[in-house]
Every structure is written in C-alpha cells, then in structure tokens.
C-alpha cells in the first residue's frame, strides 16, 4: 500500500520500510495531521518561552529566527514530547556558548502510541523537518550546511530521514542513543546512517539487547564517529534503588523517566553537559571498552581525540572514515564531564602491603584522591593507573601522595614516592619528585623535579 500527502510526498509499506525481518508488519505512518509535527523556536532573545513557527515566510519573519545563525533542531523519541524540559535545557546551554536558532520538534501526536506505529511515524517527522529545511533554503537562501539535527531514540532516525530527504546536504546529525527495535540491522534507507548528513556523530548509552535486557539503544555503529561512554551499555548512576531514582535531583517526573529508561536518557544528559564542557568528554580510539579500561588506549593519538557531544565537529578526522569508535568514562551524576589522567608512581622506603593514593594540584583546580595501586609496595617499583577526574586541574603544579598499610604495623614503616609522572590525555607530561618518606596516613607533597 501507499499513501500520499500534498507537501510531503508518498509513503509506502513496501520493503524495506515493512515486510523485512526487523519489521515484519506492514504498517503505514499516520497522516501529517495526526502526527502533528510542531516547531518550537527558542533563541538567545527568547530563551525561556518558545515561539511556534512553521515553514511559512510570515511565520519565520515574525519570529526571532535569524538567518545569519546556525539552526539546531532537537527531535525527541518514543512517548516523549517537544515541550519536555530536556530539549529546552539543550537550547539553554547552547545560548551560553553561541547565538543560535534552537528548534525543538514536537511530534507527541505520533510518539504516544505503540512502538511499531511510532517507528513508522518518524518518517512523517523526518519529512516535515526536511520540508522545513528546504523551505528555509528556497525562501531565505539558508544553506542546509548550517543545519544541525539532534535526535534522541526514534528522533535520531527521524533526523536520518530528514537527512536522506535532503540528499545528505544537512551539515550535521547527532544521534543520541538511536533506537534499536525496528532499526538495528536494517538497510541504511530505513535508519540513521553516515550518508544522511555531511557529518554524523552518535552517542550510544543503552546498547544491551532489547531482549532480554530491555536495552532501547543501538549497539551498531551508524555514524562517522560513534561514542560508547562507559562502554555504551550500563551507565554509572543508573543502578540506584527505586526510591532514590524516582526522588531525583531534577524532580519526580525526571526521576520516574530515569527509573524507566535511565541508560537511554543518559545520552541527552551527556550532550547537554558537553555544551558547557568543551574538553570534558574526550573519546579515545580503542579496540573495545575492555581494552580501554585496561588502560591501553591512553593518551590520545597524534591526531587528537574527538569530544563526545556538542564539540565532536571540531575533530579534524571526523569524516576520514565511517564507524570510527571511541570510548570514555563519565561521571555518575551531572556534571558528567571527566578529565582522564595517567599517573605513574615510583616508590621508595620500606616494602609493605597496602594502598597508594594520589591527588593532583594544578593552575585550574585540584582533584580528589585517587587509588593508583593496591598490593605489595616495593621500593624502586613503579605503579601506573589511569583515572577520570571530575576536575580539569590544568597545568600540574604539585602532587600529593599518601599510603595506607594493609596491616597494622607497630614498627611504623615509612614509604615515599621518589617520582610521580602525570600525563594528560593530550600526552603532556609533568614530573614530580621527593626524597622524603612518610608513615602511613601522612601526606607527602611532591614538587616539580
């Protein structure tokens, strides 16, 4: 079957849209009237209250839309709505760093139904966004390369459809945990893929299989750059007990959403935080997350590391290839940004069994204490570890060392760190030395060698 609409053209239930393994039911999308796609414009001039706009000259001219600015569309996913706080929060953070037309796309008319139907309705949403982009080009000479479409879940595939319909001329598409069911393993025509825009970046946060794990997001790479924070499956802070999850810092409703789909929603929270942390989400090229956590992918290569989220487009090699995979760790609650350091400690003093901890002090701030090693502490041995600090300490000025004994030793042995090397993710090294040794639980300050 096929259904046609005046502005948007025709939609068929033929393969690959339906009747394939991943989507066996022959279903057509609902009509544009029923999906009721709305465009809610926030700008630096109206950051708190949207202006509803349409692909119409008088509507655009009568709004705060500025043709000399970039335009970022944000498309929500299944069951969600365009007026939800998270979309406006993305816009508000954008206004802190740029002048921009920020358009939240509401399609709750088509998202609040069964999932299979909603997965077809995104074709209408994508067509509506494409129509809007083409209208801006024809009416105002606005280049599609100045358009960035950000889509969460089903919204990521709606963004892909908008990109496909505009022949890949859109500047950028960001997929925030693109939806897995009905999309993973399907032909590129159906789902988000790298040909949908000049640059496609993706954040995967809920990549467990839908059956039996209820992972809503894709594990499949679908962009030029695909980021897998915390491995892309289980996000830190998402395994709280029910009560503490629902009684959330952002309110009961956000807590309830988190309880239902915490990993899946993390993708837009990371993106939101990335806007105001330009270097806090460095993604490391690596064979797998297991290899990354084994400390084998540090520091960044000579070409640098891309930033997951808003600043991914600053990466020089962003379109060198498709399916480039990057790994990183985040925090377990907002602010999610982290700065990774490698610390190598060369020990002095007595041989003991215990824990060594280090804290970093720099011109931008100071870190917490981090455990570098636990086990046998032998003089002249060197122990290395990597950790993710919630503070960017800047250029290192000083390091503090402390150790704890595994056994209570009445002889009060002394241990020191003759040398500590700190390496930042860009490969910058700072060397610190001390001839001293200290008893356990006593801080030792190391200064530049």
């Amino acid at each position: 079957k096929e259904v046609c609409y005046e502005r948007l053209g025709c939609f068929s239930d033929d393969s690959p849209w339906s009747g394939i393994t991943e989507r066996p039911l022959h279903i057509l999308p609902w009509s544009p009237k029923d999906v009721n796609t709305r465009f809610l414009l926030y700008t630096n001039e109206n950051p708190n209250n949207f202006q509803e706009v349409a692909a119409d000259s008088s509507s655009i001219s009568g709004s705060n839309f500025k043709t000399n600015r970039k335009t970022r569309f944000i498309i929500h996913g299944f069951i969600d709505k365009g007026e939800e706080n998270w979309l406006a929060n993305v816009c508000k953070n954008l206004f802190k760093v740029e002048s921009v037309n920020c358009i939240c796309v509401d399609w709750k008319g088509g998202s609040r139904t069964g999932y299979t139907q909603a997965s077809q309705n995104i074709r209408i949403v994508g067509a509506e966004v494409a129509y809007f982009v083409e209208f801006l080009q024809s009416a105002f000479g606005y280049s599609p390369s100045n358009v960035h479409v950000i889509g969460h879940s089903l919204g990521a595939h709606a963004a892909g459809e908008a990109g496909r319909r505009t022949n890949g001329t859109i500047g950028r598409i960001t997929g925030l945990d693109p939806a897995e069911p009905c999309f993973q393993g399907t032909p590129e025509l159906v789902r988000l893929d790298p040909s949908d825009a000049k640059f496609v970046d993706v954040i995967h946060t809920d990549g467990a299989p839908i059956v039996p794990n209820l992972g809503f997001g894709m594990s499949q790479v679908v962009g030029h750059l695909d980021f897998f924070p915390n491995g892309g499956v289980e996000m830190p802070g998402c395994k709280k007990n029910i009560l503490s999850q629902i009684v959330d810092i952002d309110g009961i409703w956000e807590g309830t959403r988190d309880f239902a789909a915490c990993n899946h929603l993390r993708s837009y929270k990371y993106y939101t935080d990335s806007i105001v942390n330009p270097d806090g989400f460095a993604g490391f090229p690596c064979a797998s997350y297991n290899v990354f956590t084994a400390n084998k992918c540090f520091p960044c290569p000579s070409g640098g590391c891309p930033q997951m989220g808003h600043y991914a487009d600053r990466y020089p090699g962003k379109t060198n290839d498709v399916g480039q995979k990057f790994y990183l760790d985040t925090g377990d609650a907002s602010n999610f940004a982290r700065w990774r350091y490698k610390v190598s400690v060369t020990l002095s003093g007595k041989k003991v069994t215990g824990h060594i901890l280090v804290s970093l002090f720099g011109n931008k701030g100071n870190s917490k204490q981090y455990e570098i090693f636990k086990g046998t502490l032998k003089p002249d041995s060197t122990h290395s570890n990597e950790f993710d600090s919630d503070v960017d300490v800047g250029d290192l000025q000083m390091v503090k060392f402390i150790w704890y004994n595994n056994v209570i030793n009445p002889t009060l042995p002394r241990v020191g760190a003759s040398k500590i090397i700190v390496e930042t993710n860009v490969g910058k090294q700072f060397n610190f030395c001390s001839p001293e040794t200290v008893r356990e639980e006593v801080l030792l300050t190391l200064t530049p060698c």
Epitope: P236, T353, L357, Y370, D388, D390, N406, I408
Partner: nanobody
Framework: QVQLQESGGGLVQAGGSLRLSCAAS????????MDWYRQTPGKQRELVGR???????NYADSAKGRFTISKDNAKNTVYLQMNSLKPEDTAVYYC??????????????WGQGTQVTVSS
Amino acid sequence: QVQLQESGGGLVQAGGSLRLSCAASGTILSIIYMDWYRQTPGKQRELVGRITAGGSTNYADSAKGRFTISKDNAKNTVYLQMNSLKPEDTAVYYCNALITRWDKSVNDYWGQGTQVTVSS
C-alpha cells in the same frame, strides 16, 4: 553513591553482648579501612577500633579484650562484637570508612549511627 548503614544496636543489660554491623553499599572497588567510633552526649567522638583492608585490627584501650572487629569482604560488611558490656559503653556507635569507589576516587564515608544502651 556509597552509603554506610549500621545496625544491631539496642538495649542490653550490663555484662551482656551485642553485635553491630556496618554494611557498605554502592559500587565499591575497595575498602582501605573501616573504623568504629562512639559518641556520648556533649562529648567528642572517640575511636573504638579499626580493621584494615588486610584484616588487621587495632583497638582503643577501653575496647581491648572486650570488643572484636571482623569483616566479610564478600558482603562489604564490618562487625563489632561487644562483650562484657558496661553502662559506660552506652553511646551512639558510628562506622567510618575510607573507600575507593568505582571511578577510583577515594572518599571518607560515615554511617548514620546506631544507639547502644547498657543498663545496670
């Protein structure tokens, strides 16, 4: 987030025994040490004893010979076995731990406390 929860407090007669538990929950890489403290109204908290990561223990003079600290690594739980209790042992008992979290950051954590009352 890491949390410490004490339990096992209550009312006991002089000469009796109580076993307090302190359970650490959250994503924990290691417990570097765990201390038991106690506090009576108007006084500062005093250290009762410590157990290290290796299971080594140390006690304040007031606890030596009567109190024993042990732990169950699998359950991230530390116990304070108190025997031959005296009225002067009446206090709120707190556990305190230095814990390495999932992200390798090391923080000091306190429990909410459990009341122990020894009647004469």
